[in-house]
């Protein structure tokens, strides 16, 4: 089949824009650390890089292959307010490189870490 | 309480970076349209803008207040492969502005649309 060059160019552009790579995302701090329901953070979210995007096949998953850690200082508020906001320093995982990995390999990797 | 200027500056930066606004995201086309499990798209994902980020309170939700539509041509593949990839044209909702809205208002809005 012969396809229009413009269509092929735009499809190629879509492939590039959606590939598996570190992407800036908003992390809800309370949810990330599973804190008590009466503990709040200001700001409630932080911006970090996490692997995201799409892989070329159903059996592949976009996973981080290297991680750095970013230290951020936020205010922690506990209600009822017996004292003012307390500064807390939190270290966040920041994905620096990613790869499309077989879901089976990911499963094995996770389970070998758990088994250790 | 007196807080270090550096801390306040970095917190302000975090607020700005994580605010509710249109963000570039990857949409898995098959999941978005809930198609049959033997229908695949190449590329499998497209890049569009959707509202995201955090609101200042639990009771608020980041919602789109205006939407444009982006037309993209992809290839659809049905397995088993009895014929080649077929072009499909998809108009994707692309959020152009966002606002933190009360979850109750969002619920009312959605249900008034459904009730119409």
């Amino acid at each position: 089949a012969h396809y229009n060059t413009e269509i092929l160019k735009s499809i190629d552009n879509e492939w590039r824009k959606t590939q598996c790579m570190p992407r800036e995302v908003c992390i809800d701090v309370g949810k990330e650390f599973g804190v008590a329901t009466n503990t709040f953070f200001k700001p409630p979210c932080v911006s970090v890089y996490r692997c995201g995007g799409c892989c070329n096949s159903e059996g592949l998953q976009c996973m981080n292959t290297s991680t750095s850690y970013l230290s951020k200082t936020l205010f922690e508020i506990t209600v009822p307010l017996s004292q003012g906001p307390k500064p807390v320093t939190i270290s966040f995982a920041n994905h620096t490189s990613c790869r499309c990995m077989s879901k089976l390999d990911v499963y094995r990797q996770v389970h070998s870490i758990i088994r250790r | 309480a007196h807080y270090n200027t550096e801390i306040l500056k970095s917190i302000d930066n975090e607020w700005r970076k994580t605010q509710c606004m249109p963000r570039e995201v990857c949409i898995d086309v098959g999941k978005e349209f809930g198609v049959a499990t033997n229908t695949f798209f190449k590329p499998p994902c497209v890049s569009v803008y959707r509202c995201g980020g955090c609101c200042n309170s639990e009771g608020l939700q980041c919602m789109n207040t205006s939407t444009s539509y982006l037309s993209k041509t992809l290839f659809e593949i049905t397995v088993p492969l009895s014929q080649g990839p077929k072009p499909v044209t998809i108009s994707f909702a692309n959020h152009t502005s966002c606002r933190c809205m009360s979850k109750l208002d969002v619920y009312r809005q959605v249900h008034s649309i459904i009730r119409r």
Epitope: - | K31, E32, F33, G34, V35, A36, T67, Y69, I90, S91, F92, A93, I114
Partner: nanobody, 118 residues
């Protein structure tokens, strides 16, 4: 039990129009996505058109500009307006509805026959 009921199929001359409809009974929630597939004799089932509650729409290039998909959330119904019908549009048309959630589910209609012939 959730059921999808299609109607509107039939015999039509080339260049004519038909409007298919598909209604879901047994669900109080509106599906996230709704759409239509078709299957011609001896051929694979192919995607024709689809729509999401977020306003996105999809059309196979073979029907683009001739077919229009629309939905009525209040009635949990999806429509396919088919204009300028061609003999190659002859097929059984199946609607589907997709509910999102922790366990996404698809439901299918029983199919409605569309025949384009002079």
């Amino acid at each position: 039990q959730l059921q999808l009921v299609e109607s509107g199929g039939g015999l039509v001359q080339p260049g004519g129009s038909l409007r298919l409809s598909c209604a879901a009974s047994g669900s109080s929630f509106s599906p996230y996505a709704m759409g239509w597939y078709r299957q011609a004799p001896g051929k694979q089932r192919e995607l024709v058109a689809a729509t999401t509650s977020g306003g996105s729409t999809l059309y196979a290039d073979s029907v683009k500009g001739r077919f229009t998909i629309s939905r009525d959330n209040a009635k949990n119904t999806v429509y396919l307006q088919m204009n300028s019908l061609k003999p190659e549009d002859t097929a059984v048309y199946y609607c589907y509805m997709h509910w999102r959630g922790s366990d996404p589910e698809n439901y299918w209609g029983q199919g409605t026959q569309v025949t384009v012939s002079s």
